[in-house]
Amino acid sequence: AITEAREEAKPYPLFPGPFPGSLQTDHTPLLSLPHASGYQPALMFSPTQPGRPHTGNVAIPQVTSVESKPLPPLAFKHTVGHIILSEHKGVKFNCSISVPNIYQDTTISWWKDGKELLGAHHAITQFYPDDEVTAIIASFSITSVQRSDNGSYICKMKINNEEIVSDPIYIEVQGLPHFTKQPESMNVTRNTAFNLTCQAVGPPEPVNIFWVQNSSRVNEQPEKSPSVLTVPGLTEMAVFSCEAHNDKGLTVSKGVQINIKAIPSPPTEVSIRNSTAHSILISWVPGFDGYSPFRNCSIQVKEADPLSNGSVMIFNTSALPHLYQIKQLQALANYSIGVSCMNEIGWSAVSPWILASTTEGAPSVAPLNVTVFLNESSDNVDIRWMKPPTKQQDGELVGYRISHVWQSAGISKELLEEVGQNGSRARISVQVHNATCTVRIAAVTRGGVGPFSDPVKIFIPAHGWVDYAPSSTPAPGNADPVLII
């Protein structure tokens, strides 16, 4: 049967009975081998039944004395089997054995849960020699026990290559409950049930769990650890904790905040990073995410022109990197821009609207209805056209660029002319006779040169020929026009 000592028990006497050889209690030890600095124990547990033989490992010495009497089996004397004490208290326990003097170099080692205890443990071995035997007492002390000191302690002694092992001494350190799992902060959907877990251990067991929500007890009758609380849903933020109770008292977990997921706040600080004729690069600072990660954002763009039809263009983008290039915009136009972002709950309101403008661009279309004819009397080529639609000028017209290419007998030369924005005609001198002249015209703004019109060709004959009909831009889909006289 296990003997059990509680911390309230009186210390056992150091030597409850005489060791073989009539060891006196006032006998001073011949040798004391401290393994660590001295310690005054609050409790001392010593052998209680020194006379009873050990039931475990026993070494039977092969050597006999001078009188040839066989030596008795060597065994550790029985001691207290179970020590229960509170955390931070001190404890001392020991093993004792009587060894015939014929054995030299006997050492005792301490083991806990199958591992040898080495290093700076408070272990002291004392030797009490007598005529025939030496009483050896190995003491082990712990000044302030912790849970990690819980376990089964044994002594081992090697003698004649035989190992003698003591009965185990079970140390049970009791204290307040210790949490192995505490509730964790969560972000939850409104009115949706969720679980919280709390687990605590002793000893002593059992450990009972109370749940607390916003400082009110959820369960008046505790549950045994571990406990899972199903919270039926929340409409507003709440703080939860759990209380773990055992016979030593109670421990309270950390309080955790459970937040209710909501739609995000609108983005702030929408700003223009860069503008071109047809695009605007914007950035924004996201608002509060409503305890739920942003999924994506929506950029809303509407023309600021009061005469516009007020339609809104919507561009969807990922929530990161809080940057978006709005494309397909008109040049030299004013826009109102707002940003909204969404999480799993829904869309935020739109950010404050900001005004942004695109810059001038090069015209997007060429001049229309280009016609070319030869004025032989003045030796000029007359060119006429219609200016591109205002909407597609993408800026203020500053003029036109005329390209005329002269091809004759394997020779080709291109000339460029710039003309002002007023008017829609030009006259260029004939450069080569008996040649083909190819004319193209592009509109020009401060934003650049637009596309050239389709080429219009006219044949310039040798001197002395008559006036000829004009050549003009073909209808779409026709081959390059050429006027052959």
Epitope: E220, T230, P232
Partner: antibody, heavy 118, light 106 residues
Framework: QIQLVQSGPELKKPGETVKISCKAS????????MNWVKQAPGKGLKWMGW????????TYAEEFKGRFAFSLETSASTAYLQINNLKNEDTATYFC???????????WGAGTTVTVSS | QIVLSQSPAILSASPGEKVTMTCRAS?????MHWYQQKPGSSPKPWIY???NLASGVPARFSGSGSGTSYSLTISRVEAEDAATYYC?????????FGGGTKLEIK
């Protein structure tokens, strides 16, 4: 299935004592607290208190301290309500109700009617 | 202790009508439970923790609210809904019940 079966109606004289029972079945009796609720004729519900079925510790609402006693017979999964020194105003139906988290009474007995009349 | 006031005390409705009864608390509560009681019977758990229907409760019932104001709504009243409905708070001890709303069907 889970149920709470209460003892039958009682007719008592003022000053007498009554003890009514509530037998639980279909669940582990000691895992849930047991509550007692009073309903006077034509009136609403009034929580009287509860008993911890694990420890046997009773808790009484202020109005029901003194003459009222909750007790258990755990081996029989039964809770008891005893009213001493009965008064006319104790005439009511008394319900036992199983306690779930958040003071939610998820299972109710059918009620025991106690009539106090001289 | 928290006092719960239910209104109206008596509610009369025709089948198919939508009805709402309210429960006001003298101070803020976290959850409100609701029970249905018919004459001669024990109360039945009806709505748990503000908005969760108890087992077997028809989906035409719903509960909502927060703080000091809670309500039970029946989207289309049926004859079998005639009963007294009690609210009961969880937030602070002791648990308290409202005085009840009696629903009559015309």
């Amino acid at each position: 299935q889970i149920q709470l079966v209460q003892s039958g109606p009682e007719l008592k004289k003022p000053g007498e004592t009554v003890k009514i029972s509530c037998k639980a079945s279909g669940y582990t009796f000691t895992n849930y607290g047991m509550n007692w609720v009073k309903q006077a004729p034509g009136k609403g519900l009034k929580w009287m208190g509860w008993i911890n079925t694990n420890t046997g510790e009773p808790t009484y609402a202020e109005e029901f301290k003194g003459r009222f006693a909750f007790s258990l017979e755990t081996s029989a999964s039964t809770a008891y309500l005893q009213i001493n020194n009965l008064k006319n105003e104790d005439t009511a139906t008394y319900f036992c109700a199983r306690y779930y988290n958040y003071w939610y009474f998820d299972v109710w007995g059918a009620g025991t009617t106690v009539t106090v009349s001289s | 202790q928290i006092v719960l006031s239910q209104s109206p005390a008596i509610l009369s409705a025709s089948p198919g009508e939508k009805v709402t009864m309210t429960c006001r608390a003298s101070s803020s509560v976290s959850y409100m439970h609701w029970y249905q009681q018919k004459p001669g019977s024990s109360p039945k758990p009806w709505i748990y923790a503000t908005s969760n229907l108890a087992s077997g409760v028809p989906a035409r019932f719903s509960g909502s609210g927060s703080g000091t104001s809670y309500s039970l709504t029946i989207s289309r009243v049926e004859a079998e809904d005639a009963a007294t409905y009690y609210c009961q708070q969880w937030s602070s001890k002791p648990p308290t019940f409202g005085g009840g709303t009696k629903l009559e069907i015309k």
